[in-house]
């Protein structure tokens, strides 16, 4: 299996945005790569978003996706937005080298994303 590295922990910003790098050790010269972000929480795994891209080109997520990303060589910079405290969990990066054959699959160990909802602003007396 292909090795995929990602940070162990990331703290989302106060605006609910978390970014992390997913890096894969490509055994071949892939031209088309598929990246999927999976969320694991309470032993349930769900797909957060997925994108296919040509090496050297931008990642294209669906228009309504909460993910955006850029690629550089064997690194993918992923950003997940609109996160709330309830979205805290382990976010796993799955990389598939689709074409040309052979097919390679790599799954990272996951990035624990912590999301803290911002405190509401106190009423002001001014």
């Amino acid at each position: 299996a292909m090795h995929v590295a990602q940070p162990a922990v990331v703290l989302a910003s106060s605006r609910g945005i978390a970014s992390f790098v997913c890096e894969y050790a490509s055994p071949g010269k892939a031209t088309e790569v598929r990246v999927t972000v999976l969320r694991q929480a309470d032993s349930q795994v769900t797909e957060v978003c997925a994108a296919t891209y040509m090496m050297g080109n931008e990642l294209t997520f669906l228009d309504d996706s909460i993910c955006t990303g850029t690629s550089s060589g064997n690194q993918v910079n992923l950003t997940i937005q609109g996160l709330r405290a309830m979205d805290t969990g382990l976010y796993i990066c799955k990389v598939e080298l689709m074409y040309p054959p052979p097919y390679y699959l790599g799954i990272g160990n996951g990035t624990q994303i912590y999301v803290i909802d911002p405190e509401p602003c106190p009423d002001s007396d001014f």
Epitope: T31, E32, T52, Y53, M54, M98, Y99, P100, P101, P102, Y103
Partner: antibody, heavy 118, light 107 residues
Amino acid sequence: EVQLVESGGGLVKPGGSLRLSCAASGFTFSDYGMAWVRQAPGKGLEWVAFISNLAYSVYYADTETGRFTISRDNAKNSLYLQMNSLRAEDTAVYYCARSGLPYAMDYWGQGTTVTVSS
Amino acid sequence: DIQMTQSPSSLSASVGDRVTITCRASQDISNYLNWYQQKPGKVPKLLIYYISRLHSGVPSRFSGSGSGTDFTLTISSLQPEDVATYYCQQGRMLPWTFGGGTKVEIK
């Protein structure tokens, strides 16, 4: 039910051109790579060309590179094969096939016959 | 290109017989070996992919085995409807290549 229906075959003179079409239904076309495979009369199967689901990747058999062009229109659920500079040895039944991992062709159309003869 | 060699090119067996077809690749193709069935005058159909996984709707009398360069398609009990030409195909590297086919007939 997965259905693939080819059209566009016919008789053409050497050096001529043809455009084959394949209409797909019964599955989400934009999720799958597609291939063209041909079979000369009384012969075996020969892979011709492949296009990935979003058309990012396109590949051809060595003999067809430069003469054939594979393309797709996901909005129309259609696959195409533009064949130029046709030769007698291109005479065959041309099948369009859906390609799923692991690079197997899991569903095939009924085929369209291309005859190159003067 | 990876060459795929099938043997025998044709065989004749009785209904109920165990039939074995072999396919040899010119280099290691890992798990990327698929088998197709083409009945006379019909369209090819995927039988087995990833060496041994049956495609949907394929009867359990068909099985595949092997690794690396040597692979086998087995029909455990030949039925009249199994009369066809069988092709192996490698998906390990482009161009994808097929074996020459094995024609199976009933005695």
